[in-house]
């Protein structure tokens, strides 16, 4: 019987000669565990594994700690692929970061870290970045160092209050800090003045409300 | 850890100015707003306003208009607290305190009023001719 | 400006309950804070938001806010927790912070 191919991320898809964008079935590192994922094959070269997407408000990001741990949504739309998933990926190797962004104006804008990795379940999946460029800001919206990921039913901030309830969605929160791309969806019109909408401060200022955004990762030596 | 460390105590003449720094660590100092509060000899806490380090923007409390300037220099996490034409019944123990910003705005009509979690050791300034 | 009533001093055995009071116009619709001041220290928090503890808080440290009066209790009072009391609440109205006038808690010996 003809030995089934695995795939890690969307990076092994691509070298494999799948270069059309959309949902591959992804493998989770040493195990046989199976997860369903965009792939991005034509954006700066291609072979991104989409993590995160938001564009129409369609799904609602206000989840428990398993259901961030796991991943909800629809990969062809809005959805979290899941923290256990991108944690064991991004402790494999050397995986870059890079954030896409669109405002409500028609301007789109870009963070890219030259590390990325999650630390695991028992460090409640604290980020780690390095290395950042891009038009989105000179300075990082995820602050840095990184902080433990917070959800409305796992409260790992660093403020007295909880940053998960009053802002929304689960997140890398500080106190509560410079983003959060999981917050409340805001049509336009509706996207300004929300200090709990979809954040990155240091592209919008802290009351806009994005558009569309797009979290995707790809090995460093791609 | 996260602390804040304040500058040395003070001996300053009437009408002259004191300044009085506050250097944060262990933490995003643009993520909290920091507050200076002061403390009269034997007497109770009193406010005298906040500068949110992300942005710069104050509020004062009404009674130290024009006499309290809050400054930050976010190279170096540091706050400052000038107070100038000094009283006699300006001696007391100047405090500074952070409190979470989690809104991460600069307009006061977003301020959130957290509790002050994280003290500095105090810097005690005496107005004596 | 919003103002903020304490005893100037409550005084309790060890081992018994200290409950300080904090008295202001309907205080019940904000959030109160409350810090411990040793002498010679800087103010600690020990309560915020009416009734949460900070992490390191002993659990014997609570509070409850309703109609015009707060209460920070001390359960099982030790001779350590002989300090000033201070309780805070925002102003909205002045955007101003006001502190009570403060609480000695004596711990009879």
């Known amino acids: 019987k003809e030995e089934q191919i695995s795939f890690r991320d969307c990076a092994e898809v691509f070298k494999s000669g799948h270069t059309t964008n959309g949902i591959y079935t992804l493998t989770f590192p040493n195990s046989t565990e199976e997860i369903k994922a965009y792939c991005d094959m034509e954006a700066g070269g291609g072979g991104w594994t989409i993590i995160q997407r938001r564009e129409d408000g369609s799904v609602d990001f206000q989840r428990t700690w398993k259901e961030y741990k796991v991943g909800f949504g629809n990969p062809s739309g809005e959805y979290w692929l899941g923290n256990e998933f991108v944690s064991q990926l991004t402790n494999q190797q050397r995986y870059v970061l890079k954030i896409h962004l669109k405002d409500w104006e028609g301007n789109e804008a870009y963070s890219l870290y030259e590390h990325f990795y999650l630390s695991s379940e028992e460090l409640n999946y604290r980020i780690h970045l390095k290395g950042l460029t891009g038009t989105a800001g000179k300075i990082s919206s995820i602050s840095q160092p990184g902080n433990d990921f917070s959800t409305k039913d796992g409260d790992n901030d660093k403020c007295i209050c909880k940053c998960s309830q009053m802002l929304t969605g689960g997140w890398w929160f500080d106190a509560c800090g410079p983003s959060n791309l999981n917050g409340m969806y805001y049509p336009q019109r509706q996207n300004t003045n929300k200090f709990n909408g979809i954040k990155w401060y240091y592209w919008k200022g802290s009351g806009y409300s994005l558009k569309a955004t797009t979290m995707m990762i790809r090995p460093a030596d791609f | 850890q996260v602390q804040l460390v304040q500058s040395g105590a003070e001996v300053k003449k009437p009408g002259a100015s004191v300044k009085v720094s506050c250097k944060a660590s262990g933490y995003t100092f643009t993520g909290y707003y920091m507050h200076w509060v002061r403390q009269a000899p034997g007497q109770g806490l009193e406010w005298m306003g906040w500068?949110?380090?992300?942005?710069?923007?104050?509020n004062y409390a009404q009674k130290f208009q024009g006499r309290v300037t809050m400054t930050r220099d976010t190279s170096i996490s540091t706050a400052y607290m000038e107070l100038s034409r000094l009283r006699s019944d300006d001696t007391a123990v100047y405090y500074c305190?952070?409190?979470?910003?989690?809104?991460?705005?600069?307009?006061?009509?977003?301020?959130?009023?957290?509790?002050?979690?994280?003290w500095g050791q105090g810097t005690m300034v005496t107005v004596s001719s | 400006s919003y103002v903020l009533t304490q005893p100037p001093s409550v005084s309790v055995a060890p081992g018994q309950t200290a409950r300080i009071t904090c008295g202001g116009n309907?205080?019940?619709?904000?959030?109160v804070h409350w810090y411990q001041q040793k002498p010679g220290q800087a103010p600690v928090l020990v309560v915020y938001d009416d009734s949460d503890r900070p992490s390191g808080i002993p659990e014997r440290f609570s509070g409850s806010n309703s109609g015009n009066t707060a209460t920070l209790t001390i359960s099982r009072v030790e001779a350590g927790d002989e300090a000033d009391y201070y309780c805070?609440?925002?102003?909205?109205?002045?955007?101003?912070?006001?502190f009570g006038g403060g609480t000695k808690l004596t711990v009879l010996s």
């Open positions: 805070q609440v925002w102003d909205s109205s002045s955007d101003h912070w006001v």
């Open positions: 309907n205080i019940g619709s904000k959030s």
């Open positions: 500068i949110n380090p992300n942005c710069g923007g104050t």
């Open positions: 305190a952070r409190s979470p910003n989690p809104y991460y705005y600069c307009s006061s009509g977003y301020y959130y009023p957290g509790a002050f979690d994280i």
